[in-house]
């Protein structure tokens, strides 16, 4: 007999998700329309390709990257797709309401879809810390709260600090990481006896996680350059991101071997560390003037990522209940901070060079932006964590953490729950 959702969740999830979808359809009906302006086919295709790259990163890259659990790989991939689909819809509406609504209608362009996909990516990064411990109904709540918090953060930063799309979206790494970690902190932590094996990685899911990492690795330059203003900025961002991720791969594999007593390479380290350079150069990818600097940053990021993967999981497992293989949260929190610090260092160097007090003020503004991103991430993450703990969501029992059979129909299995 195939396993089923608990009866209450069977009632709750479809009703909750479909009611929400109906509400979104109504909002789209009343408040949105497509951009009707003329655009040539060539420009349209070029603009769409960037959005496509981002969707591949989100659906395949992050979907498979989180699928390394022995008995939770189906749920990881499919739940990621579910969250992406829902997140993009809500993000398009929210961004439109926050930035365009005074003009009456939200105009949907390819650029707004690009922005929405990047906002939804934030949830996919955060959810790595809680996947396996929550059901789809809870994930819907997480998507809504996180996309709303990120949208508001971006609007506040844009209005108060006068930063452009690229700069305020690059807080996504830090925001997503701290949001996810604070949600995880609120959820029930101890894994009961007999379920430890479920959060272990298995060979085939680990291979699919590596596939996810490869997709992310290939498309990270598109992510870092997607919101930049001009071809010269975008070109520089693509080059620098490519050099940084290339070096972080070499560093990740060799550093992983170095960190092991027998010189063996850890799959878990490599899955995450290959992306380290892309995250670290994110904020300043268009500002770095030469390849060697991007490569140095990729090297440093790779080392930090491997070091973090070696020493932080024990702490994260104890304090936050995050399994050893879910390393995206603390990895992105470290590397996102590194990226922000690199940008602040560039501003400090400007201040030293120019002896200009106003540039010093820019440094303070950047520190303020970063602090605001962390504070909003922690507060909204804690709020989400508290909401997810409510009984109405019928969260999976701790004994059924990290188990596909709680959520999926496997006709060939005769195991009942």
């Amino acid at each position: 007999m195939s396993s089923k959702y608990p009866r209450s969740v069977r009632r709750c999830l479809p009703l909750w998700a479909l009611t929400l979808e109906a509400a979104l359809i109504l909002l789209f009906y009343f408040f949105t329309h497509y951009d009707a302006s003329l655009e040539d086919q060539k420009g349209l295709v070029a603009s769409y390709q960037v959005g496509q790259d981002l969707t591949v990163m989100a659906a395949i890259g992050l979907g498979f990257l989180t699928s390394s659990f022995r008995r939770h790989s189906w749920s990881s991939v499919a739940f990621n797709l579910f969250m992406l689909a829902l997140g993009v819809q809500w993000a398009i509406l929210l961004d439109g309401f926050l930035s365009q609504f005074p003009s009456g209608k939200v105009v949907i362009t390819l650029f707004s879809i690009r922005l929405a996909t990047m906002s939804a990516l934030s949830v996919l990064i955060s959810v790595d810390a809680v996947l396996g411990k929550v059901n789809l109904a809870q994930l819907v709540v997480m998507v809504l709260v996180e996309v709303t918090a990120l949208g508001n953060l971006r609007m506040v930063i844009s209005n108060i600090f006068n930063t452009d799309y690229h700069m305020n979206m690059m807080h996504i790494y830090v925001f997503a990481a701290y949001f996810g970690l604070s949600v995880a902190w609120c959820l029930p932590k101890p894994l009961p006896e007999g379920t430890e094996d479920k959060d272990q990685t298995a060979t085939i899911p680990s291979l699919s996680a590596m596939l996810g990492a490869l997709f992310l690795w290939m498309f990270w330059p598109s992510f870092n350059s997607a919101l930049l203003r001009s071809p010269i900025e975008r070109k520089n961002a693509v080059f620098n991101t490519y050099y940084a991720v290339a070096v972080s791969v070499v560093t990740a594999i060799s550093g992983s071997s170095l960190a092991h007593p027998q010189g063996k390479i850890s799959k878990t380290y490599v899955h995450s560390a290959v992306l380290a350079g892309g995250v670290a150069v994110g904020t300043s990818c268009h500002l770095i003037p030469s390849p060697w600097l991007a490569m140095v940053l990729g090297l440093v990021a790779g080392l930090i990522s491997v070091g973090g993967a070696k020493y932080l999981p024990g702490c994260c497992n104890r304090v936050l209940g995050i399994p050893h293989s879910s390393i995206m949260g603390y990895n992105f929190s470290l590397l996102g901070l590194l990226g922000e610090i690199i940008y602040i260092v560039l501003l400090v160097l400007d201040t030293v060079g120019a002896g200009n007090g106003m540039i010093g003020f820019q440094v303070l503004l950047s520190i303020g932006e970063l602090s605001l991103a962390i504070v909003i991430a922690l507060m909204s993450g804690l709020l989400t964590g508290l909401l997810l703990n409510l009984k109405i969501w019928k969260a999976p029992h701790e004994a059924k953490y990290f188990d596909d059979q709680v959520f999926w129909k496997f006709p060939h299995l005769a195991v009942g729950f």
């Epitope: 001009s230 071809p231 900025e233 160097l349």
Partner: antibody, heavy 129, light 108 residues
Framework: QVQLVETGGGVVQPGRSLRLSCAAS????????MHWVRQAPGKGLEWVAV????????YYADSVKGRFTISRDNSRNTLYLQMNSLRAEDTAVFYC??????????????????????WGQGTTVTVSS | DIQMTQSPSSLSASVGDRVTITCRAS??????LNWYQQKPGKAPNLLIF???TLQSGVPSRFSGSGSGTDFTLTISSLQPEDFATYYC??????????FGQGTKLEIK
């Protein structure tokens, strides 16, 4: 040579619509951001709108937001400004301008600069009843 | 939004004079400031970008300086063809490009 030519101006009643065009020649149009700037009679320059090189992003001055739409057709090397719900205060000479981007570098970072280096001759829009 | 304030709003000078026009931003714009010259009935013409870089073809008597919030345009030796209106413009914010109100330079 590099040239921008605006057309579509004229006399229009308040509340009506008008579409301005700007034909570009002598450069790779799809590689440049483009602006509309206007100048009311006897007044200074007022920036109206900008569109990015690939058409992915558009920004407007508060005074025209929700009424004017900037667009471009890179295959036709043409920039457009659709003006709806026109008011008397929209009476002005409208210029299209090319945005040039450049950068300078120190050893540790790049500095990007943007400026309007090529302007059209302007087209006059008069909103009057 | 960033506001740009030019001073003086009008200025009388003679050929050969050294003239300085100032532009102040309501917040730091680093070096993202451009200067334009406009003659009556004509389109504006770019003089200086990035606060101090002279556009090609512009005479070397024009120079720009400043960073942060305070900027100046200097004409070292005024020529008859320099009598026009001058505008500063910030490009720090990629979403709103603001011009100063203009400085009209007239013959004394």
């Amino acid at each position: 040579q590099v040239q921008l030519v605006e057309t579509g101006g004229g006399v229009v009643q308040p509340g009506r619509s008008l579409r301005l065009s700007c034909a570009a020649s002598g450069f790779t149009f799809s590689s440049y951001g483009m602006h509309w700037v206007r100048q009311a009679p006897g007044k200074g320059l007022e920036w109206v709108a900008v569109i990015w090189s690939d058409g992915s992003n558009k920004y407007y001055a508060d005074s025209v937001k929700g009424r004017f739409t900037i667009s471009r057709d890179n295959s036709r090397n043409t920039l457009y400004l659709q003006m709806n719900s026109l008011r008397a205060e929209d009476t002005a000479v409208f210029y299209c301008a090319r945005e040039q981007g450049g950068y300078s570098s120190s050893w540790y970072r790049r500095y990007y600069y943007y400026y309007m280096d090529v302007w059209g001759q302007g087209t006059t829009v008069t909103v009057s009843s | 939004d960033i506001q740009m304030t030019q001073s003086p709003s009008s200025l009388s000078a003679s050929v050969g004079d050294r003239v300085t026009i100032t532009c102040r931003a309501s917040q730091s714009i680093s070096s993202w400031l451009n200067w334009y010259q406009q003659k009556p009935g004509k389109a504006p013409n770019l003089l200086i970008f990035a606060a101090s870089t002279l556009q090609s073809g512009v005479p070397s008597r024009f120079s720009g300086s400043g960073s942060g919030t305070d900027f100046t345009l200097t004409i070292s030796s005024l020529q008859p063809e320099d009598f026009a209106t001058y505008y500063c413009q910030q490009s720090y914010s990629s979403s709103v490009y603001t011009f100063g109100q203009g400085t009209k330079l007239e013959i004394k």
